[in-house]
Structures are given as C-alpha cells and as structure tokens.
Amino acid sequence: DAHKSEVAHRFKDLGEENFKALVLIAFAQYLQQCPFEDHVKLVNEVTEFAKTCVADESAENCDKSLHTLFGDKLCTVATLRETYGEMADCCAKQEPERNECFLQHKDDNPNLPRLVRPEVDVMCTAFHDNEETFLKKYLYEIARRHPYFYAPELLFFAKRYKAAFTECCQAADKAACLLPKLDELRDEGKASSAKQRLKCASLQKFGERAFKAWAVARLSQRFPKAEFAEVSKLVTDLTKVHTECCHGDLLECADDRADLAKYICENQDSISSKLKECCEKPLLEKSHCIAEVENDEMPADLPSLAADFVESKDVCKNYAEAKDVFLGMFLYEYARRHPDYSVVLLLRLAKTYETTLEKCCAAADPHECYAKVFDEFKPLVEEPQNLIKQNCELFEQLGEYKFQNALLVRYTKKVPQVSTPTLVEVSRNLGKVGSKCCKHPEAKRMPCAEDYLSVVLNQLCVLHEKTPVSDRVTKCCTESLVNRRPCFSALEVDETYVPKEFNAETFTFHADICTLSEKERQIKKQTALVELVKHKPKATKEQLKAVMDDFAAFVEKCCKADDKETCFAEEGKKLVAASQAALGL
C-alpha cells in the first residue's frame, strides 16, 4: 500500500497528538543530550511540514522517506559536533546508512543528571499552568534516558501519568494520592524499558530468526488454542512492529501495533478466550492489555509429541522440506503444552532438537539416531528447576536485601572487572527475582524467574558492550542469547583477577548518608560491599558479613550522634582499620 507521502499517511493514521508525541520520542531517543526546547522546536517544524503534506501530498519534499525527513531535521542542530562528537559524522552519510549511524550512537547509559522529583505542589502547579508542556517534558525525559523504550507503550505511560496528576492535584492529600502512583509508573517504566531492550538486542545482535523463535514460544504459551498458522501470522506481524520500533521507525511501529491489536480483537475467537476484556478498552490500554494478557487454558486434549516429532517415519523428510517451519511447529507444540517452562528453556529444547536432526538426518539410520532425543531434554529442564529451587530457598531465608548482597558477592567474584555501579544495579535487579517470582506456585516460577533474569542479564550485556572490560562477560553475552543465564551461572571465581589497590577514600562516608532514603542507603552499602570484594576476592562469606555488620552499626551510630560529621570522620578511620584487619588487607 504505497502512499504518495509517507509523512502525510502517518499523520492521518495516528492523529496530530500521537504524531507529535512519537516524533518527540524519536528525536529524544536519538539526540539524548539536546535541551527540551530544541526538541520541541524541531517537532513543531516537522508537524507543520506534515500538515502541508496532508493538504497536498504532491507538495515539495512530501514524497521523501521519514528517515530522510527526520534525519535532515536532526542534522540541522547547530551544536551537533560539540555535543555529540563523532555522531555528527552521521550527517555526512546518505540514507539508510545515516539512520544506522544514528542508531549505533544511541547510549544506554547517557551521562544525564538523575531525575529528581520536585515537591508535589510544585508539580501540580506546573501541570495546571501548562499541561501540554508538562506531559511533553515527561516523554522527553523518559525517552532520552531510555533510548529503546517501546514508543507506543510510552504513550500509554504518559496517559497514565496525566491521569494521575488530573486526579491527585485536586485531592485533599495530594502527596498521598500522587506519590504511590508515580512510584508505580517509575518501577513499571523501568521494567518495560528493560524488556524492550532485550527485544531490540535480540533483533539487532542475533537477528530476526532469534526474535521470531522467541515470539513463537511466548505466543504459543499465551494462546495455546490458536492454530499454528494463526500464531505464525501474529509472530510475523509482531516481528515487524518490534523491528520498526527498535530501528527508530516509531510512527510505522505505532501504526502497525494498532493494526495488530485490531486484528487480534477481530479474530479473538480463533486466538484466545482471555482477550474479551482487553478488546473493550481504548487503543493504548487495549494494546498494553493484550501484551500482558494471561495464558489461555490449554486445549482439553493434546497428544504426545512423540508421534509427530520422533516416531513418524517422515521426521527427516518434513525437516528437510522446510526446516524453519518444522522447527517452528515443534516449538509451537512444545510451548503450548508447557506454560510452566521459561521461553529460554523452550528455545534451548528446540535448539537441541534441531542439532539432533541435523546430525541424525544425515546418519545411516536416522530414526535409531534420534529415537531418544527427548532424553536429552531432561538435564536441560532440571537445571533451571534446581537453580530456582535453591535460590528461592536462599531468598526466603535471607530476605531481599541480603539476597541481593549474596548475588553482589557472587557476581563480583565472577566478573570483578565490571564497573561497581553496573554490578550494583544488575545484582540488585537480579535479587528482585525473589520477591517477584518465588511467591508463585511451582508451575509459574520458571517462566517468571528465568525470563526475568534474561532481561536483567541483557542490561549487563548492553552496559558492558559500551565499555568492554571482561572477556567472560563478552563471551556469555555474545555466544548464545538463550544460554546467557546458564553461561553466567556456570562462571566460577575469576582466578586471573588482580585485586584492586586498597583506597581508603572509597570507604569514607559523610553525614549526608543519614538523609538518604532507605533504598539509597542500601545502594551505598552495596557499593562498599562490591569494592570490598574487588579488594579481597577470596574473602569468605563470614568475613564479608562481619565487615558489613560493622559498617551498618557504624552508620547507625553516627547518624544518631550530635556531631555527625566528626563521628563519621573518627569512627570511619577505625572502621577502615578494623575492616582491613578482618580481611587481612
């Protein structure tokens, strides 16, 4: 369906409000350091141009691609060279190379100040004074900090953000109403960003086939009553949506996502019985709801897979005729029977099956060769089951904070070269798997835990890719997408690591720690723990626990003291000396 003017087509499909919001997100995700006002100006210029094209699709430049139009606009930024350095070189390239160049310069960890939440009254005044600017600012700040955030989903977050302020700014107790809602949006937003980052990494680093395999497995678990052909169609459409969003084609992505939601709702009878409520909602809520919908019940009767995938004399013939279709059917049939497995486990099983067929279909007696293929699945299934059982027991014994600390020590010993902030952030998130997943019954634990861990380990991978410091991290991140977690789990203490020089400054604390929130205080303590392990990687659990207990007591004592700063200075020296002695430094 070729349109004379792509920009006019998208403007008409999406409407002015969504068009402007998506262009702002796109620009902020590309030029993450540009001031808000500059972006608003660029967006307004693009919007005015789009309107001229809606009026007359034959008008000058209206036939240009969106990449060309947006790229040209970004390249008009006067401070491009001094703000972004070599990214300015992208502007010398032609499309599509220019867009690829912009994509490569997206920064997962931009050097931006932490977002500080103003007082509730200040926020409510700003919201009432200029609602439109207030909401645009939200889109801008999230998009520039999360350059792969799923744009149509960010529109949904913005809608909820607006609803929170509309409701709470007229409540009797504004803070009690608003702050929990903002906390929820922040936490959900971070989770949404990380999930989408994994999808983009899957597409960009491992290709469309890897993403499609993931989608077949997940959609087959979610829609076990749908036919394979239906799942395949949904996978194709979903792949297109995510390829577009990950590629910066946000207008096309949002448009296609809306079309996909419409298709799913029009065909829900042949997809899932769980979609009814979702499909009654407005567009943004509908798309979000479909993406989060619970798994449908399995069909009443499903035969053993053995007949079609092991015992049939046509296994090798079917495989040879259309390898990916046959493997897709295997994955579909396996996944719809196993909502209790993680997607990554299902993909490992499919890979094992593929490897077996590759080997056996070339053998003298193929059937004899692959007859026991499902026996090879047993250890693959039991490994995550056992790991989750052990870690949930540890979590239940320790609680979240101490469980995070156990993981901090474990991962710092595995990859001590990784920066301390990254180790703290990743280990804290790994530790959240306990409260997120261990409460579930066994049948839901593995999909919850292992698929969540895949998301968190991808954060480690993308942060490490920016400044690679560990061959072991590079190896686990790049060899196999589905084996990342087992790869990291299998890492032992890095014996090649030369311990870091002791630096007293790292363990010097000040009275400002007393005014921090509980979460920020935990991060301070966990930062110190990582540094301790980097200084003394062979320290035992008991030694580290003793030092951390002393540290907690020291902070508590000095925060109660009248002269806090003096206490931190004097007691701090004693603590450092005692810690050095305890660890044999």
Partner: nanobody, 124 residues
Framework: DVQLVESGGGVVQPGGSLRLSCAAS????????MGWFRRAPGKEREFVAA????????YYADSVKGRFTISRDNSKKTAYLQMNSLRPEDTALYYC?????????????????WGQGTLVTVSS
C-alpha cells in the same frame, strides 16, 4: 495438590491378566495427563503408558503395545491399566503419575505427582 493411590497388583501366571487402578484425591484429575511407569528389580524406572486429559489420546511403550490398555474415568477421579498376556519381564513395581503439563507423556520429569506403587509379579 493430588494424592495418588495404586491398587490391583498381585501375583499372576504368565499369559494372565490384571487390572491396576489409580485413585486420585485432592485436585480434579481432568486437567492432568495420567501415566503408568514401572521399576523392575535392579533396573531403572521405565515408562509404560499414558493417557491425555480427557482420554482422547493414549501412548504406550513398545514393550507393552497391544497387550496393555490405559483408560480413565474423570468422574471417579481414577485411571486404569488393563494388563493382558502378562510375561515374567513385566514383573515390577507399578507407579501411577499425574502431569499437569506434558509434551512427551513418556518422560518422568514431566509428571508432578506420584503414587507409592503396587507390586505386580508374573511367575509360574
């Protein structure tokens, strides 16, 4: 949770028949694949037969095909194993198992609940 209790085992001559029953208590068994496994003295546990949730599909080990028949009555929360033309090599402790999710039917790791077993001895 599901508790499973097997019955019907005993001593029988070669060529004879037995009918094993597996009674479930707790959950409704209609959402579980039901299977029978056995362990002969000094051997590994092996798959015998399994039946899909509503009974539409059955699956057998090659060694028992044509001799054993698995069935179920969901209203009675019971699964059965009719064993005909018994042989000495069928001597084993027979276990009933229930699997909420099962792709292969024959894999013990896909079953969540197990009975204590009932002994079948085939001897002249």
């Amino acid at each position: 949770d599901v508790q499973l209790v097997e019955s019907g085992g005993g001593v029988v001559q070669p060529g004879g028949s037995l009918r094993l029953s597996c009674a479930a208590s707790g959950s409704n068994i209609s959402s579980y694949v039901m299977g029978w496994f056995r362990r002969a003295p000094g051997k590994e546990r092996e798959f015998v037969a399994a039946i899909s949730r509503s009974g539409g599909y059955t699956y057998y080990a090659d060694s028992v095909k044509g001799r054993f028949t698995i069935s179920r009555d969901n209203s009675k929360k019971t699964a059965y194993l009719q064993m005909n033309s018994l042989r000495p090599e069928d001597t084993a402790l027979y276990y009933c198992a229930a699997g909420r999710y099962s792709a292969w039917y024959s894999q013990s790791y896909e079953y969540d609940y197990w009975g204590q077993g009932t002994l079948v001895t085939v001897s002249s």
